[in-house]
């Protein structure tokens, strides 16, 4: 259904292979990426409320797909604050004791349960902060053909930002 206005391969914005996205735009894509859909000649990336497409062979496209596959983009993305770049250690980062592992949040009930139960939080190197200010996440849904539903994918809880007193993302444990 490439070319269809309502299909999963409709593109709000096409990025030419001749002019790949800037570093800043790529960071924005990483942060807001929700899903991707492989089309015949290009890949469509679904963001919060819009979509962008690029050629299947373009390096930036492959990088973004890999990023989402590994859950290092989108809901799980915490990002690096630009002015803190110099604070990132070049030697192995020394971590404070982490309080645990993350878990995907599927339902409001689970979200409430996990909020009550959670003591878990990923550890960040000193000086690292999350730049993701989004506090709420939708439940995981499949991508509708109109392409506007959001997918809170694997480990969606990883970058839930805590109140400002806590630096870094929160990882929450759901009830099993």
């Amino acid at each position: 259904n490439e070319g269809s206005v309502t299909g999963s391969c409709y593109c709000g914005k096409r990025i030419s292979s001749d002019s790949p996205p800037s570093v800043q735009f790529m960071n924005r894509l990483r942060k807001h990426l929700r899903a991707y859909h492989r089309c015949l000649y290009y890949t469509r990336f679904q963001l919060l409320s819009w979509s962008v497409c690029g050629g299947n062979k373009d390096p930036w496209v492959q990088e973004l797909m890999s990023c989402l596959d590994l859950k290092e983009c989108g809901h799980a993305y915490s990002g690096i604050v630009a002015h803190q770049k110099h604070l990132l250690p070049t030697s192995p980062p020394i971590s404070q004791a982490s309080e645990g592992a993350s878990s995907d949040i599927h339902t409001p009930a689970q979200m409430l349960l996990s909020t009550l139960q959670s003591t878990q939080r990923p550890t960040l190197p000193v000086g690292s902060l999350s730049s993701d200010k989004e506090l709420t996440r939708p439940n995981e849904t499949t991508i509708h053909t109109a392409g506007h539903s959001l997918a809170a994918g694997p480990e969606a809880g990883e970058n839930q930002k805590q109140p400002e007193k806590n630096a870094g993302p929160t990882a929450r444990t759901s009830a099993t």
């Epitope: 960071n27 990483r30 890999s66 590994l70 290092e72 915490s78 971590s95 995907d104 550890t123 990883e158």
Partner: antibody, heavy 118, light 113 residues
């Protein structure tokens, strides 16, 4: 060819420390999500720890059983991951495997044996 | 945590016959962001590290013989060895990487009948 080579294992007394290293080659290390998985003799596989990539601030995650005792770190410039293990217990005795999760699959090393005994 | 239930725990199959191992997860491993199932299958022989056979539930790792077939989606997955060879005798594990902590099935010991 993808290679993960673990080192640093050995015999240590309860309460002691060890630092495991995992040297990687054959793939883009900085893009991989690294994990440690262990296996006690004759037992199943148990996930131990995970470290994310630089864009995600090298955030780390730990199994409840090692929380507060183990520290996972990585040095992308050296293509190496590290697991600092403190306050070791007899139940930490296992083969420790370094794994690299990439979009092309999950690569495993040959493992390094950690024995905690008095 | 996601619980992975693998069955059977042991299996004896004649050479040349089909072997089927099942794995069930306590929640769906299908991510709507990319329509991929976050499930892997491993083979482990005594004294060796686990060897990746299948990832994304059905993608065969490079160099793995095509008699190893991964199938399934959501919560139910199957590893099929279409024609068992003597060198396939090993313990097989399924693993979910949809969520942290990674969790593994209890293993299936595959033997020659």
């Amino acid at each position: 060819e993808v290679q993960l080579v673990e080192s640093g294992g050995g015999l240590v007394q309860p309460g002691g420390s060890l630092k495991l290293s995992c040297a990687a080659s054959g793939f883009t290390f900085s893009n991989a999500v690294m994990n440690w998985v262990r296996q006690a003799s004759g037992k199943g596989l148990e996930w131990v720890a995970r470290i994310r990539t630089k864009p995600n601030n090298y955030a780390t995650f730990y199994a409840d059983s090692v929380k507060g005792r183990f520290t996972f770190s990585r040095d992308d410039s050296k293509n190496t991951a590290y697991l600092q293990m403190n306050s070791l217990k007899t139940e930490d005795t296992a083969m420790y495997y370094c794994t690299a999760w990439t979009t092309e699959g999950i690569y495993w090393g040959q493992g390094t044996l950690v024995t905690v005994s008095s | 945590d996601i619980v992975m239930t693998q069955s059977p725990s042991s299996l004896a199959v004649s050479a040349g016959e089909r072997a089927t191992i099942n794995c069930k997860s306590s929640q769906s491993l299908l991510y709507s962001g990319n329509q991929k199932n976050y499930l892997a299958w491993y083979q482990q022989k005594p004294g060796q590290s686990p060897k990746l056979l299948i990832y994304w539930a059905s993608t065969r790792q490079s160099g793995v013989p095509d008699r190893f077939i991964g199938s399934g989606s959501g919560t139910d997955f199957t590893l099929t060895i279409s024609s068992l060879q003597a060198e396939d005798v090993a313990i097989y594990y399924c693993q979910q990487y949809y969520d942290t902590p990674w969790t593994f099935g209890g293993g299936t010991k595959l033997e020659l009948k």
